[in-house]
Amino acid sequence: VPEKSVRWCAVSEHEATKCQSFRDHMKSVLPSNGPSVACVKKASHLDCIRAIAANEADAVTLDAGLVYDAYLAPNNLKPVVAEFYGSKEDPQTFYYAVAVVKKDSDFQMNQLRGRKSCHTGLGRSAGWNIPIGLLYCDLPEPRKPLEKAVANFFSGSCVPCADGTDFPQLCQLCPGCGCSTLNQYFSYSGAFKCLKDGAGDVAFVKHSTIFENLANKADRDQYELLCLDNTRKSVDEYKDCHLARVPSHTVVARSVGGKEDLIWELLNQAQEHFGKDKSKEFQLFSSPHGKDLLFKDSAHGFLKVPPRMDAKMYLGYEYITAIRNLREGTCPEAPTDECKPVKWCALSHHERLKCDEWSVNSAGKIECESAETTEDCIAKIMNGEADAMSLDGGFVYIAGMCGLVPVLAENYNTPNPNCENTAEEGYFAVAVVKSSSDLTWDNLKGKKSCHTAVGRTAGWNIPMGLLYSKINHCRFDEFFSEGCAPGSEKNSSLCKLCMGPSPNLCEPNNKEGYYGYTGAFRCLVEKGDVAFVKHQTVPQNTGGKNPDAWAKNLKEEDYELLCLDGSRKSVQEPANCHLARAPNHAVVARKDKADCVQTLLLDQQRMFGSSVTDCSSNFCLFESKTKDLLFRDDTVCLAKLHDRNTYEKYLGEEYVKAVTNLRKCSTSPLLEACTF
């Protein structure tokens, strides 16, 4: 059956031979209606990429550099299956490119000019492409030829395989730049030896190199890693201190109509029957005809790449930056230590309008990028299409798991001028009901629920976390008869109560009328039995404070809070009747942009923050007529975090634990991708 056939692309006679063997052996173990293999032979990996894009083939396995080529337009391929190494219990699908130095040296990443460098080899990922790509804009001009620029940047180097005649400085630490193990400083172990012997000041290698060469922890403790934020960390902190995370070997397919489920079904079956130590007659991860045919010989199996993970996310911001710099050879005109405009991520067109007005008023210091969901915004910040946004705590958790950092906190209670330096405790997550109802925390089953959005703190993580510990399952849509929880599956009962309008029904953005704090309260007013919101929501939308038609006549006393002990209290008593304390919303950014974002925002709030009194004739950053656009409307200021500068420290142990528990029920495709 052609639609059940995966056309594998082979790039040599030997690969084609192995592919045919793969095809025949799969035929013998799979049912006739299962997936099948067909073989397509091309002259090179780039030809395979083009063939897949043109629908003449379906899959090929590629190294990271080629995954980058495959992702570029017009190819637009995406990773679908990753080879893993190591054990099934602890599968490794990535390695980390690191810069290793001796502990007794005293320079940082931005002080490498004039040092001596040790590389694994010319054109190799961890040893050359990544470090030189990331340093590219610091290299002296002209930057072409690249080897000459690198030779003039470092005071001496060992770059195996470089041309020692044309670029003698690149071979200063290893005369001749031998391109094999005859050169004692060749490859990973060689580059590390070059550092260890004192020939060089820095070695560009893999994270595992130091462990493979120094079994003794005391010896390893003599070395450190250089981090991109110009700090140092110990060699076992490579996950938090690396130049780039590099995928090892990856199967790619078309982004649209790419047969990824079929490819996974095929490879999953293949690893079951012909994986490591499975079969004598055919082995997926070795071959009598040559090395690394179709798949790497060192691979132990395959893992399915999460569907939300596109090539940009898979390759990572640092890797793409490095490769793009090398390929395109372009650098910003401004010096790299100067802050460029910050690209704010706006959710849907309402936030975009406010962002545009901010951009005009900021004299171009703020630019705007849009996305339809918070998770799409986080992904854009990760890959460099945007720089920052303010997030509810639930999304600060997801952003943190995706490598972003909190930069500033929204403060709601502290008056100026102390606001900027005050760390607030947080706000209360509450359950609101109509005073006229007889609901309590203990009889919510079968009722109609209103939530700010799936994944948000007060509207989801806290109430559903508490509910989960009571009912011990994730079928919240069965617990409530119906509800509106924007971001739920469209056919779920938790989208039934949402108001839309139609194409935006249940979308987790402001196009859905029942989205966010105000939206969830509106849902309660118009259709629901209980709303999960922040403690300020009722006071902010009653007594004429919200002029919208649905809210203008509402009275605060018509609503009450549900307490966990089964009692109810006035909305004026949240301190004595709440579900939990929630961390304030916070601005997040990539680590490399955090300082610039902080400096710019502190400056912007001095001009457009809560000190502006007349928002009818001035732009106000924290005002959007109860709609919480870009920031919560009750924000008094954005406050410095001081030492709470990681998502764990910012959110606090208790909240992180609660959200981690709720991950069993996670519907976050981004979180799945970021924890891959």
Partner: nanobody
Framework: EVQLVECGGGLVQPGGSLRLSCVAS????????MAWYRQAPGQQRELVAG???????KYADSVKGRFTISRDNAKNTLYLQMNSLKPEDTAVYYC???????????WGQGTQVTVSS
């Protein structure tokens, strides 16, 4: 609430010029920010140029150096001078003063600009 009416659009050849006007029904002197947006068929509405009460301006990269935004508070009018027009500038152009919040769909009729030979 101030009503805004756009005019001045039309059919023009590539390289040609047009001047759009947006006349307000009341005073614009105290309005913080005014802007021109455009929307081509099947595209999102995008910011073309904006101007603050103090006269500071911002332009989309695609129109920098070709378009100029200005406001005449005495005449309660916002302008967009468009030079060196290109086919990709073809769109309906709208003006806004952001004064009705960011939430309601409060766009006017707009004015059609078509750049074609």
């Amino acid at each position: 609430e101030v009503q805004l009416v756009e005019c001045g659009g039309g059919l023009v050849q590539p390289g040609g010029s047009l001047r759009l006007s947006c006349v307000a029904s009341g005073s614009i002197a105290s309005i913080a920010t005014m802007a021109w947006y455009r929307q081509a068929p099947g595209q999102q509405r995008e910011l073309v140029a904006g101007i603050t009460r103090g006269g500071s301006t911002k332009y989309a990269d695609s129109v920098k150096g070709r378009f100029t935004i200005s406001r005449d508070n005495a005449k309660n009018t916002l302008y967009l001078q468009m030079n060196s027009l290109k086919p990709e500038d073809t769109a309906v152009y709208y003006c806004t003063d952001y004064s009705r919040g960011y939430y309601q769909d409060y766009w006017g009729q707009g004015t059609q600009v078509t750049v074609s030979s």
